[in-house]
């Protein structure tokens, strides 16, 4: 009876999410494997988040709006492990917007989700950021490694969206 009611709850939750995400990919987790964590298909998952790589070339503001429509934000990178996971799926000759910007050009960088900007957990390429006119951050492959660079916000780039996993 308990299992039945849990399944009914799950199905109703799935139906609720289906209006936003036509397809979800879910895995069982938790100590009793009773919880399902889901990401929209074809998003990838890492820890408690889902990631989507957009190959559409758009400005930073349009890229953030695009993520927002999908219930996400441009990616906020919190650890080196997270960055290493993300970069596995990126093309080395491309650049991708991050959810990091400096709208006033005062070198006050801010994450889109209001996560405090911690200088100790940043992965700027050597010599970056280097221009107060370049107020948005990308991740790209340079000098044999992935890192961040400041660029003009209005220049179209690919982008990465991130959202919390859906638990049902």
């Amino acid at each position: 009876n308990f299992m039945y009611s849990k399944t009914v709850k799950r199905l109703s939750k799935l139906q609720e999410y289906q209006q936003y995400y036509p397809s979800l990919t879910c895995v069982m987790e938790g100590k009793d494997m009773e919880d399902w964590s889901c990401c929209p298909t074809p998003w990838t998952s890492f820890q408690s988040s889902c990631y989507f790589i957009s190959t559409v070339m758009q400005s930073w503001t349009k890229s953030q709006n695009n993520c927002s429509v999908m219930g996400a934000d441009l990616v906020v990178i919190n650890t080196k492990e997270e960055q290493d996971f993300i970069t596995q799926n990126l093309k080395i000759n491309s650049a991708y917007f991050l959810g990091l910007s400096d709208p006033k050009g005062w070198r006050h960088w801010q994450w889109v989700d209001q996560t405090p900007y911690n200088k100790n957990v940043t992965f700027w390429h050597s010599g970056e950021p280097n221009s107060p006119d370049e107020r948005c951050a990308i991740i790209n492959f340079r000098s044999e490694e992935w890192g961040w660079n400041d660029v003009h916000c209005h220049v179209p780039q690919k982008s990465i969206c991130k959202m919390k996993k859906i638990y049902i």
């Epitope: 006119d133 107020r135 003009h152 209005h154």
Partner: antibody, heavy 121, light 111 residues
Framework: EVQLVESGGGLVKPGGSLRLSCAAS????????MSWVRQAPGKGLEWVAT????????YYPDSVKGRFTISRDNAKNSLYLQMNSLRAEDTAVYYC??????????????WGQGTTVTVSS | DIVLTQSPASLAVSPGQRATITCRAS??????????MHWYQQKPGQPPKLLIY???NLESGVPARFSGSGSETDFTLTINPVEANDAANYYC?????????FGGGTKVEIK
């Protein structure tokens, strides 16, 4: 006082080339992105090319891509526009304009007086 | 590309009256309260001159008779009261995304 002075315009035959120059003074040229904007006779404004302050980024509309090249020499406080394979529709007054960044975009806060390019056989 | 449509194409205004020019963008040029729409004045034989930046900010040295408003896709330049030397073409321009684009212009004539 900020000054932008264009030169190099003139009459050229279709298929020909011209190099426009813009001499900047009164500000730290190397700190600003710069653009060329043109205006055909009796028409509106059309952006033609942009170059970032550090020369790392150039951008063109499809109408001139592959034919026009924007460049700068920060040591000489000068902006250039090399125009090749010129067409009749490139006939216009060409303005050099300084970009001032604001939030996620920019605007053109100073403009030169313009130089006239006429493409005709 | 973002298309900017200005209206009217021309208008004639008497000195002391109000002139209103609108600029409609094919998509939003706003982001979190910042509106990346700018206005320029161009008199015959002269280069454009910046009047208003970011929808409503008056450029230094521009008379307070000029004002701008709007957000997202709809923006307005107002001249009130109009003076004789305001006869010119007026252009809007967006910069939220490359390529930067201009409106087709509005010619203001003084009656």
């Amino acid at each position: 006082e900020v000054q932008l002075v264009e030169s190099g315009g003139g009459l050229v035959k279709p298929g020909g080339s011209l190099r426009l120059s813009c001499a900047a003074s009164g500000f730290t040229f190397s700190s600003y992105g710069m653009s060329w904007v043109r205006q055909a006779p009796g028409k509106g404004l059309e952006w033609v090319a942009t170059i970032s302050s550090g020369d790392s980024y150039t951008y063109y509309p499809d109408s001139v891509k592959g034919r026009f090249t924007i460049s700068r020499d920060n040591a000489k406080n000068s902006l250039y526009l090399q125009m090749n394979s010129l067409r009749a529709e490139d006939t216009a007054v060409y303005y050099c304009a300084r970009q001032l960044y604001y939030s996620y975009g920019y605007y053109f806060d100073y403009w030169g007086q313009g130089t006239t390019v006429t493409v005709s056989s | 590309d973002i298309v900017l449509t200005q209206s009217p194409a021309s208008l004639a205004v008497s000195p002391g009256q109000r002139a209103t020019i609108t600029c409609r963008a094919s998509e939003s040029v706003s982001f979190h309260g910042t509106h990346l729409m700018h206005w320029y004045q161009q008199k015959p034989g002269q280069p454009p001159k910046l009047l208003i930046y970011a929808a409503s900010n008056l450029e230094s040295g521009v008379p307070a008779r000029f004002s701008g408003s709007g957000s997202e896709t709809d923006f307005t330049l107002t001249i009130n009261p109009v003076e004789a030397n305001d006869a010119a073409n007026y252009y809007c321009q967006q910069s939220i995304e490359d390529p930067p684009t201009f409106g087709g212009g509005t010619k203001v004539e003084i009656k």
